[in-house]
Interface confidence: medium
């Protein structure tokens, strides 16, 4: 921020009323009036360029220092070119000297040169040459000097002429302050600039109303430089929850808006399915029947548990069931839907039912499913199963009601046997099979059906109680179609896939395991 100047003395603004002291009295410096831009201006002028040694002094009135530590002196002046006078005026000079003296009281007209300390010799950047003078072009020079630290109650400035043709049009004395400042929602008070150029005064800021230092953040501080400029901002304040930054202040969130933490972000509109918030809200309450999960951000709409899975099918395949369903029609406004599958089995004879999680096998863990299908295997034949698929989301735990759909299926057949070729020769095939152990007790016999591939007119059947059979009297180098089916007291079980097995050719005779 730009430095603030506090003016202690302004000759140009005084309209010739200051009455400065001249020494020697009545000679040298003289107050005169001129017209510039159609306005009267006053100036202190001296032009004794032909008179040899000059020592003309002009002293200001006593200036009260106040709180100033370092003062700045701005001079606006014009100096005529010595060559513009006849003969070049051999004693003519083109500079003058600036002095100051500190004192605790006003000495009035008692002027003593020895009390004054020289600040500098003031030289013009541009001198007024004859043509400029004749054309009324005033070549105005601006020079600034500073003095400090000052310690007494007040001071004088003095101007010593040593034979120049000079006019002082403006003498302005001021000190600098770092102005009152609002930055980063922190207020910094007006601060007097220090007197030593390298030093920076550290100034603590205060958070504006409804602003706070963020957790772990630095307290706001700035540095007031000697020229009255604020430098090196450190830390900041943020509008607290329920308030947002509007220009340099924190303003309460409007009704229907909220802000849940101290941050730089503005208030946000209350999300869907929330009640209208009052002014200065830090969150928006959910409508009845809608909830917020603990991990949900306040900016997220309130949500509700999902409806039940929309459509559930249970397709039996022997001792397996594939469950398929479609997502709920109402997701509750959330995307974190998961499904849980539970199983209940009932014995048709007794009507007795119980959970069956321990006896069945799922293609993937039945809780927290994200896909919409699962296969359940190791089901027992001639048993009624009821499967429940429940849809849940992040807020389901906040209500007691459940959203589920059920499907029932009766297992009337055993699972198809898994068949493999154990060995073969030119005239025989050795075949084995297996079914899940829970179903083995219900099987009476196994029926093996086989025929030559391409011959649909005749087939052979073999029955056995074991889990393997050797089929003899087969033709060499011939492909046979083989199927195994379990036989139970209630009838036929599910048949296996039809397998193609080939006997060996005569050249490659010998028993070869596959």
């Amino acid at each position: 921020a730009q430095g603030k100047e506090v003016v202690l003395l302004d000759f140009a603004a005084a309209g010739g009323e200051l009455g400065w002291l001249t020494h020697p009295y009545g000679k040298g410096w003289d107050l005169m009036q001129n017209i510039m831009n159609d306005m009267p201006i006053y100036m202190y002028s001296v032009c004794n360029v032909m008179s040899g040694d000059q020592d003309n002094w002009l002293r200001t009135n006593w200036v009260y220092r106040g709180e100033a530590e370092r003062i700045f002196i701005e001079l606006k002046f014009t100096v005529r070119d010595c060559n513009s006078f006849p003969g070049g005026a051999s004693s003519c000079k083109e500079t003058f000297n600036l002095y100051y003296a500190e004192s605790d009281l006003d000495y009035g007209t008692n002027f003593q040169k020895r009390l004054f300390t020289k600040i500098d010799t003031i030289a013009p950047d541009e001198i007024t040459v004859s043509s400029d003078f004749e054309a009324r072009h005033v070549k105005l020079n601006v020079e600034e000097r500073s003095v400090g630290p000052l310690t007494r109650k007040g001071f004088y400035l003095a101007f010593q002429d040593i034979g120049a043709c000079v006019a002082l049009l403006s003498v302005r004395v001021y000190y600098k302050k770092c102005p009152e400042l609002l930055q980063g929602l922190a207020h910094f008070p007006e601060t007097i600039a220090g007197s030593d150029a390298p030093s920076l005064a550290t100034v603590a800021g205060t958070c504006v109303d409804h602003a706070v230092v963020p957790p772990g953040g630095e307290e706001p501080r700035m540095h007031c430089a000697v020229d009255g400029e604020w430098l090196v901002p450190i830390g900041q304040c943020l509008c607290q929850a329920g308030y947002e930054k509007v220009e340099d202040a924190c303003q309460a969130c409007s009704p229907g808006f909220f802000k849940f933490e101290a941050s730089e972000s503005p208030c946000l509109e209350c999300p869907e399915h929330t009640l209208p918030s009052p002014e200065g809200a830090t969150s928006c309450e959910c409508e009845e029947g809608f909830f917020r999960a603990p991990q949900d951000p306040a900016s997220m709409p309130c949500t509700r548990p999902p409806s039940a899975p929309h459509y559930l099918t249970a397709v039996g395949m022997g001792a397996k069931v594939e469950l398929r369903w479609t997502p709920p029609q109402d997701s509750g406004g959330r995307e974190d839907i998961v499904y849980s599958v539970t199983c209940e089995q009932c014995w048709p004879e007794s009507g007795e039912c119980g959970p069956c999680e321990a006896s069945v096998r799922y293609s993937e863990p039945p809780h927290g499913l994200t896909r919409t299908s699962v296969t359940v295997s190791d089901l027992e034949p001639h048993m009624n199963y009821t499967f429940t698929v429940e849809a849940r989301n992040g807020v389901s735990g906040l209500v007691t009601s459940r959203s589920f759909r059920t499907a029932s299926v009766s297992i009337n057949q055993t699972e198809p046997p898994k068949v493999r070729l154990e060995g073969r020769s030119t005239t025989s095939l050795s075949v084995s099979w297996s079914i899940p152990p829970p179903q083995q007790s219900r099987v009476w016999k196994y029926e093996v059906t086989y025929r030559k591939k391409g011959d649909s007119n005749s087939y052979n059947v073999r029955r056995t109680e074991g889990f393997s059979v050797t089929l003899d009297d087969l033709a060499p180098d011939t492909t046979y179609l083989v199927q195994v089916q379990a036989l139970t007291q209630e009838g036929q079980g599910a048949g296996s896939k039809v397998h193609e097995f080939q006997t060996l050719s005569p050249e490659g005779s010998g028993n070869l395991a596959v």
Partner: antibody, heavy 128, light 107 residues
Framework: EVQLLESGGGLVQPGGSLRLSCAAS????????MAWVRQAPGKGLEWVSR????????HYADSVKGRFTISRDNSKNTLYLQMNSLRAEDTAVYYC?????????????????????WGQGTLVTVSS | DIQMTQSPSSLSASVGDRVTITCRAS??????LAWYQQKPGKAPKLLIY???NLHTGVPSRFSGSGSGTEFSLTISSLQPDDFATYYC?????????FGQGTKVEIK
């Protein structure tokens, strides 16, 4: 020694024209502001016009504005006053006058000029 | 325009007398005032500029004073060569104006 010598005056009828000249010597003409000042018979002095050292700016009294033209030729050290549409009230002795700021011991020039050097004058009579 | 009024219009004095002529401006002209002396049939001569500065070659018995609107020309001891008409002129404004003149005659 500074010398200013006017010429060109005489009798002229109302509405007529006349051109006055002022020959300068004894000083650096191109450094001087030059002016014409007139004095009606038995009356006081009246400023007529001025011209800057290099030919500008020029200023005129309201009574002659639009009728008189001041000019100078620094190569000939001569000042001129072209007078058109002359009136009876223009009858006067016309003086050429000069001002050199080098002799003016002030830091800032006055808004206008005074006249350090004068010619002996030339009489202009406007009469029918 | 700025009006300049001189007083008196004429005065009679003796050699050796102290004579003061005044000039009043219709508005403040600071110290931008000159005084001239004119003898019959002659061109005016500059005496004083900037209200109080004596022009080169002018005898020191002539002095000027004043600022703002009130000015005066003083001849401390009137000499035979000083009987003439005296004019003031303001040069604050570009329409430089003269007073109507003060005639100093021998008593």
């Amino acid at each position: 020694e500074v010398q200013l010598l006017e010429s060109g005056g005489g009798l002229v009828q109302p509405g007529g024209s006349l051109r006055l000249s002022c020959a300068a010597s004894g000083f650096t003409f191109s450094h001087y502001m030059m002016a014409w000042v007139r004095q009606a018979p038995g009356k006081g002095l009246e400023w007529v016009s001025r011209i800057g050292p290099s030919g500008g700016p020029t200023h005129y009294a309201d009574s002659v504005k639009g009728r008189f033209t001041i000019s100078r030729d620094n190569s000939k050290n001569t000042l001129y006053l072209q007078m058109n549409s002359l009136r009876a009230e223009d009858t006067a002795v016309y003086y050429c006058a000069g001002y050199d700021s080098g002799y003016d011991y002030v830091a800032v020039a006055g808004p206008a000029e005074y006249f350090q050097h004068w010619g002996q004058g030339t009489l202009v009579t406007v009469s029918s | 325009d700025i009006q300049m009024t001189q007083s008196p219009s004429s005065l009679s004095a003796s050699v050796g007398d102290r004579v003061t002529i005044t000039c009043r401006a219709s508005q403040s002209i600071s110290t931008w005032l000159a005084w001239y002396q004119q003898k019959p049939g002659k061109a005016p001569k500059l005496l004083i500029y900037k209200a109080s500065n004596l022009h080169t070659g002018v005898p020191s018995r002539f002095s000027g004073s004043g600022s703002g609107t009130e000015f005066s020309l003083t001849i401390s001891s009137l000499q035979p060569d000083d009987f003439a008409t005296y004019y003031c002129q303001q040069y604050q404004s570009y329409s430089r104006t003269f007073g109507q003149g003060t005639k100093v005659e021998i008593k």
